[in-house]
């Protein structure tokens, strides 16, 4: 009764330092209350990057200084994150809980690796 | 005698479109005289992008209008592609042919997956 | 606060049968999957078998299949373990413990203080 | 089945220092399918991480797990002498749900 989580392998963030994905997940059951959680790891560490629970059918809410956003729709989570820098390229993982109704499941994907290129700075205006 | 040819898997362009690897190939023979082929790979074409015959020892050249400019160190050749844009996003592959003396060897790398974000335009400085 | 409290352990002589019981409480018992650990003395964990939320699934180590059956009562909050043609290698302490999931595993977050069982003739 | 192979066997350190244990699987584990616990001599073991790098409740965040495959890893930040104990790496990803042999982190 495993929960596959599917996530893209390579996103580029843009020029602005926003990178987006979806995460997919094969749900098991019927669930109402799902939680999203997206982990950074590089260098062997892993890191919580944010989080947020949601009811199906729902408004994805990460908290005020997140700086992730979201949508849902179905099975799917449509995940941007921003403000990001070059020394944030590294591996987002995915994590995906069905809190309620019991019993619990959880699902982790393989990662996105989301390369980031600080832009040249803008040559200043006389 | 097959002659293994090594190239890291991805790069990324700086924000001014320019994209370093090195290509480095184990010589089965004593060559005098190689070639270096840089090839891309997307959607199953692959075109060359640029190509350089060089003396052992000697400086890399390619032609006055190559995207693509060089040097050698031993068995290593240390490419740079300018001028690219996000389409030409894509897997090049780094091809190596000892031309001389003979016998003839010829290897090719895995490819390098470079990746190009095109940069934001900068203000109109008024 | 959620306990587990196993019992039944003992002393038994080999080829013999014994049950193992553990109540549990502070929980919504028929929500999680329930594993049975072992621990002979002075030696590492052993997982034993486990039981899905609603018993319709049920797995064993290759060590004990075909001898030991898990089985749960969710009305009685109890979890079991019948322990049929009992091997000296069988000795050990017995501990219950409560799983995250349901009927997929991924953790084992609540442990009782074990039971042990002794196979001597 | 599933073999998982902890390393070193024996840890010495000192309370402040950083812990690196490892665990090897004989094939590739779901990340989401590995579990590390703590044991204490005459004491139930305590669950720390599960899906390789989630902590469990009460977990202190000294404590953290990373790796993929079959290679899998837990640290302990700065070692507090609480610390001091056998850890066990677990699969879920197949059964039987084998544990490893364990690592004893002692006292320097």
């Known amino acids: 009764k495993a929960m596959h989580v599917a996530q893209p392998a390579v996103v580029l963030a843009n020029s602005r330092g926003i990178a987006s994905f979806v995460c997919e997940y094969a749900s098991p059951g019927k669930a109402t209350e799902v939680r999203v959680t997206v982990l950074r790891q590089a260098d062997s560490q892993v890191t919580e990057v944010c989080a947020a629970t949601y009811m199906m059918g729902n408004e994805l809410t990460f908290l005020d200084d997140s700086i992730c956003t979201g949508t849902s729709s179905g099975n799917q989570v449509n995940l941007t994150i921003q403000g990001l820098r070059a020394m944030d390229t590294g591996l987002y993982i995915c994590k995906v809980e069905l809190m309620y109704p019991p019993p619990y499941y959880m699902g982790i994907g393989n990662g996105t690796q989301i390369y980031v290129i600080d832009p040249e700075p803008c040559p200043d205006s006389d | 005698k097959a002659m293994h040819v090594a190239q890291p898997a991805v790069v990324l362009a700086n924000s001014r479109g320019i994209a370093s690897f090195v290509c480095e190939y184990a010589s089965p023979g004593k060559a005098t005289e190689v070639r270096v082929t840089v090839l891309r790979q997307a959607d199953s074409q692959v075109t060359e992008v640029c190509a350089a015959t060089y003396m052992m020892g000697n400086e890399l050249t390619f032609l006055d209008d190559s995207i693509c400019t060089g040097t050698s160190s031993g068995n290593q050749v240390n490419l740079t592609i300018q001028g690219l844009r996000a389409m030409d996003t894509g897997l090049y592959i780094c091809k190596v042919e000892l031309m001389y003396p003979p016998p003839y060897y010829m290897g090719i790398g895995n490819g390098t997956q470079i990746y190009v974000i095109d940069p934001e335009p900068c203000p109109d400085s008024d | 606060q959620v306990q587990l409290v196993e019992s039944g352990g003992g002393v038994v002589q080999p080829g013999r049968s014994l049950r193992l019981s553990c109540a549990a409480s502070?929980?919504?018992?028929?929500?999680?999957?329930m594993h049975w650990v072992r621990q002979a003395p002075g030696k590492g964990l052993e997982w034993v078998a486990v039981?899905?939320?609603?018993?319709?699934?049920?797995y064993y180590a290759d060590s004990v299949k075909g001898r030991f059956t898990i089985s749960r009562d969710n009305s009685k909050n109890t979890l079991y373990l019948q322990m049929n043609s009992l091997r000296a290698e069988d000795a050990a302490v017995y501990y219950c413990?409560?799983?995250?999931?349901?009927?997929?595993?991924?953790?084992?977050?609540?442990w009782g203080q074990g039971t042990t069982v002794t196979v001597s003739s | 089945e599933i073999v998982l192979t902890q390393s070193p066997g024996t840890l010495s350190l000192s309370p402040g220092e950083r812990a690196t244990l490892s665990c090897r699987a004989s094939?590739?584990?779901?990340?989401?399918?590995l579990a590390w616990y703590q044991q204490k001599p005459g004491q139930a073991p305590r669950l720390l991480i599960y899906?390789?790098?989630s902590r469990a409740t009460g977990i202190p965040d000294r404590f953290s797990g990373s790796g993929s495959g079959t290679d899998f890893t837990l640290t302990i930040s700065r070692l507090e002498p609480e610390d001091f104990a056998v850890y066990y790496c677990?699969?879920?990803?197949?059964?039987?749900?084998?544990f490893g042999q364990g690592t004893k982190l002692e006292i320097k």
């Open positions: 413990a409560k799983d995250l999931g349901g009927d997929d595993y991924y953790g084992m977050d609540v």
């Open positions: 502070g929980l919504t018992f028929s929500y999680y999957g």
């Open positions: 039981i899905s939320y609603d018993g319709s699934n049920k």
């Open positions: 094939q590739s584990v779901s990340r989401t399918y």
């Open positions: 899906g390789a790098f």
């Open positions: 677990q699969q879920y990803g197949s059964s039987p749900y084998t």
